[in-house]
């Protein structure tokens, strides 16, 4: 292991606790340790240990309590299925390794619903859905045995119920006990038993919950009825003054530690950013909590439906704010969240039983004071009137998530505080704080969104292309002339925009080469769409050698492009995805996403530039305000501008300028950053303004960039607001919905 | 306010160039996102756009018509032009100039009151 | 006073770009209704426009005799921006 065995900060000696064919970690400042194994494997007999009083670890005891000398990284199986009702399934065999298939078929007379064929995955769970043979005779459904997991009670009558148990060990995830309800869907969701080392895949998490979050966001008309037996999909009317509340609580106590607690403030913003980008606009109310609980924004409070002011407020909180008090109170947590659900004077207020009410819980797991959390949910649910009314129980006004971080989450406890609710997963166990990390990420990026303009993968994982989804490289062969290189960026599934003076009109489609994404291959080239009013030699004969206004062009591509995690579009002005992007409201003119995204003062904003291979994104300043015509008079010094008597020859109402030292120290394009895009970032999206066109300073004369660049080196883009009758009409059947 | 005048020949032989002239106030045709068009309406017929001059100059025409126009501007005089070569009797029309605001959800907000023209030979 | 309602199809989707014009029969041009919906300024509030896809209507709620003009619906969508036929109205 890599740790030296000089003892821990706790008392327990670190002599003879190593794991065969495995490492450890020390946990808790030394007063716990987790077991780590290679993927595929786990460790035996338990995952942690903790360093008791006596100054010695827990022993290392199995399921049925026998105790083990030395612990040791086993081969992860999957369970066998205990009992398959009216069918057969094959092979059979007392366990199953990774990569084992088993396929279900059912008698005649019987229907398989779920998975016919399921795959042994490398956590220890089975691929796919339970496999379930039913032949429609009861009221609700067959619910089924999930494999690993004991069904009593075989009668689907309405009010009939089945309990779930889980063999010594294991713990029971979901429902134990679930009743036939009216209408034909079963109370509660789908149970599974859980070894503790089993955790859930960020994909596994991203899905499950982004599907059931989905759920409760969107909703569906209540009127689509359903007949006995159907899968019902929860039924929400979204009764237009009815609104939701979303309450993020996360654990700040000591166990977490700094690095994890910022982790997941990384997800919850995320989180909110995914709820914007739906279109519906919840409260928030923000918790965190170590011994006692601390409230950020409360729910009642004006900006806590302003997405950005929730996220400035929670960027805002320090780890440290719990450092003196760092126990676990988690009821105390929930206890905060009661009190901004409740109202003054127990008075209900008008609507009271229409906002819909999503607590989200982040913690390493153990509440170590406080008493039992799940006594909260309860007087929660009581003040909702959740559960009373059997013919109108109220369950969609009510979500509980709960996120497990770590090895030390008591399955237990996390799973008693979750919602239950059909078809939906509302308790998920990661890892750890960089699984939950890819949860939120995958979460944001699953293929709804994908089509979303300026959306990017910043994660710690991705790649350049992750973090500059549209950006294209474009090279031109010239024989016997070398080859020109330009950027690009992807603007619609068929087409890329750059600057015009990458080609010359003697060009042909087969020598352009363009590749997105990061990608080896090229695309094929349809047509390149100059704009009709640029004109290289324009203004030869008034002594200006090279005219670069409305220097734009769009590469039309042969092939649709396939959107992904490293190929997406950015956002281009004046267009309905930009309109959401900013969150603005969908009146919002032409006009006014110009003074939101290129006010008259000076703008931050980006290109983006290869250096040694590697896309790196370079910041700089657009000159919008009272600098912008020292910023534009420095065109001058450009080479062949020097004999322009009026500057406004050169730099015309197209042209937007960066560069220069004020505020800031611009850094500068290069010639093979020409026609890339500079690209505003707000609302953590990226919206192109300009395309980058001409400088007056070759700052990379022998391929690298100088250091000491004078105040005059100043770069000129062309102003996308500018070209927008053009972009609009060469880009009309990309469905962009130019406004 | 804004106001569009347009004014033209009034009559052409068949094969001559029309030239009209469209004088606006009331706005200025370098403020972003105004346009101005020109479009055509034939005695008891429906209407029809011909072509659209923007702010930044770029120019827009109806490619479904046999023969294309060209449009131009004079920004600092406030007017804008349409040329048509070699006309014919088909041409015969109310010719009017409108001022577009950029933008999918705008219509044509102001309309200049017409100017005829016949082509006869 | 009477309610009357004028339709124009589309040949495909237009996304709501539709406008809807008024000339009186001395020729004068005048904007009603911008983006299917949204009354011109000036615009009587008895003028009122609907519809999505292909298929959209003016209704003129509380007809007065200096309705009396021929409509033209243009499309906004796509070049070249193209006008309907036009609907005369007149009253008994």
């Known amino acids: 292991t890599p740790w030296s065995l000089a003892r821990p900060q706790g008392s327990c000696s670190l002599e003879g606790v190593e794991i065969k064919g495995g490492s450890f970690r020390l946990l808790q400042e030394g007063q716990a340790l987790e077991y780590v194994c290679p993927s595929g494997f786990y460790p035996y007999p338990v995952q942690t240990r903790t360093c008791r009083s006596t100054g010695s670890w827990s022993t290392l005891k199995t399921q049925d309590q026998k105790t083990v000398r030395k612990a040791e990284c086993r081969a992860i199986h999957c369970p066998r299925p205990h009992d398959f009702e009216n069918g057969e399934y094959w092979p059979r065999s007392p366990y199953y390794n990774v990569s084992d298939e088993i396929s279900f078929h059912c008698y005649d007379g019987y229907t398989l619903r779920g998975s016919a064929n399921r795959t042994c995955q490398v956590n220890g769970r089975w691929s796919g859905q339970t496999a379930i043979c039913d032949n429609g005779a009861g009221y609700c459904s067959n619910p089924g045995i999930p494999i690993g997991t004991r069904k009593v009670g075989s009668q689907y009558r309405l009010e009939d119920s089945v309990t779930y148990h889980c063999s010594r060990g294991l713990t029971l995830r979901g429902s134990q006990r679930r009743t036939c309800q009216e209408g034909g869907s079963w109370s509660g969701t789908e149970p599974s038993c859980q070894d503790s080392f089993m955790y859930d895949t960020p994909q596994e998490v991203a899905e499950a919950f982004l599907s059931s979050l989905t759920e409760t966001i969107e909703g569906v008309d209540a009127e689509d009825g359903h007949g006995p037996g159907e899968q019902q999909k929860r039924k929400i009317v979204l009764d237009p003054s009815g609104s939701m509340n979303i309450y993020l609580v996360l654990d700040g106590s000591d166990s977490i530690g700094a690095s994890n607690f910022t982790g997941a403030k990384k997800c919850l913003v995320n989180l909110i950013e995914k709820v914007a980008s739906y279109g519906v606009k919840p409260r928030y109310g923000l918790v965190t909590y170590a011994t006692y609980p601390k409230i950020w924004v409360k729910v009642s409070e004006a900006d806590s439906s302003n997405a950005d002011w929730v996220t400035k407020q929670l960027n805002e909180i320090n780890y440290e704010d719990h450092k003196l008090k760092s126990g676990t109170n988690t009821k105390k947590a929930l206890q905060a969240v009661y009190s901004m659900m409740s109202w003054p004077d127990d008075v209900p207020p008008e609507g009271w039983n229409r906002t819909r009410h999503v607590i989200i819980l982040m913690t390493d797991g153990l509440h170590n004071m406080g008493g039992d959390p799940i006594t909260v949910i309860d007087e929660i649910r009581d003040l909702l009137y959740i559960g009373k009314d059997r013919k109108n129980p109220r369950e969609d006004y009510l979500d509980v998530y709960v996120f497990g971080v770590g090895p030390l989450v008591n399955q237990v406890n996390i799973n008693a505080l979750a919602s239950k609710k059909d078809n939906e997963q509302h308790v998920f166990k990661v890892k750890d704080m960089e699984n939950l990390e890819d949860v939120f990420y995958q979460m944001i990026d699953e293929s709804q969104s994908l089509s979303l303009c300026g959306m990017v993968w910043e994660h710690r994982k991705g790649t350049d292309y992750h973090k500059q989804p549209w950006q294209a490289k474009i090279s031109v062969i010239r024989p016997s002339k070398g080859h020109e290189s330009c950027m690009g960026a992807v603007v619609s599934e068929y087409f890329v925009l750059t600057a015009a003076h990458c080609f010359t009109v003697d060009d042909k489609e087969h020598s352009i080469k363009v590749s997105v994404g990061g990608e080896k291959r090229d695309l094929e080239i349809e047509v390149v769409l100059f704009h009709p009013n640029y004109n290289i030699n324009g203004k030869k004969e008034a002594g200006i050698p090279e005219f670069y206004d409305y220097d734009v062009a769009l590469i039309k591509l042969k092939n649709k492009l396939k959107y992904g995690q490293t190929i997406r579009p950015i956002c281009l002005p004046c267009t309905e995805g930009t309109t959401r992007a900013l969150r603005l409201p969908p009146t919002t003119t032409c006009q006014q996403q110009k003074e939101e995204l290129l006010p008259a003062q000076d703008i931050k904003a980006l290109f983006v530039s290869e250096e040694e291979k590697k896309l790196t994104r370079k910041e700089v300043y657009i000159k919008n305000g009272d600098k912008k015509g020292s910023c534009e008079r420095d065109a001058q010094y450009a080479p062949g501008y020097d004999k322009v008597k009026d500057i406004s020859e050169v730099v015309t109402p197209r042209f937007l300028c960066t560069g220069g030292v004020s505020p800031y120290a611009d850094p500068n394009t290069c010639r093979g950053d020409s026609g890339g895009p500079l690209i505003v970032h707000k609302r953590s999206r990226f919206i192109q303004v300009g395309v980058i066109s001409w400088g007056v300073v070759d700052v990379c004369k022998n391929q690298k960039r100088q250091k000491q660049v004078p105040a005059h080196a100043r770069d000129f883009h062309i102003n996308l607001f500018q070209v927008l009758p053009w972009l609009k009409e060469k880009l009309q059947d990309e469905d962009l919905g130019f406004l | 306010q804004v106001t569009l005048k347009e004014s033209g020949p009034g009559i052409l032989q068949p094969s001559q160039t029309l030239s009209l002239t469209c004088s606006f106030s009331?706005?200025?045709?370098?403020?972003?996102?105004?346009?101005v068009g020109w479009i055509r309406q034939p005695s008891g017929k429906g209407l029809e756009w011909l072509a659209s001059?923007?702010?930044?100059?770029?120019?827009y025409y109806n490619s479904d018509l046999k023969r294309r126009p060209t449009i131009s501007r004079d920004t600092s005089n406030s007017q804008v032009f349409l040329k048509i070569s070699s006309v014919d009797t088909a041409d015969t029309a109310t010719y009017f100039c409108?001022?577009?605001?950029?933008?999918?959800?705008?219509?044509?907000?102001?309309w200049g009151q017409g100017t005829s023209l016949t082509v006869s030979s | 006073g009477d309610r009357v309602t004028i339709s124009c199809s589309a040949s495909q989707g237009i996304n709501n770009y539709l406008n809807w014009y008024q000339q009186k029969p001395d020729g004068t041009v005048k904007l009603l209704i911008y983006y299917t919906s949204s009354l011109h300024s000036g615009v009587p509030s008895r003028f009122s426009g609907s519809g999505s896809g292909t298929d959209y209507s003016l209704t003129i709620s509380n007809l007065e005799p200096e309705d009396v003009a021929t409509y033209y619906c243009?499309?906004?969508?796509?070049?070249?921006?193209?006008f309907g036929g036009g609907t005369k109205l007149e009253i008994k």
């Open positions: 001059i923007w702010w930044n100059d770029d120019k």
């Open positions: 243009q499309q906004h969508s796509k070049l070249p921006w193209t």
């Open positions: 009331g706005f200025s045709l370098s403020t972003f996102g105004l346009g």
């Open positions: 409108v001022q577009i605001p950029y933008g999918s959800r705008n219509g044509f907000d102001y």
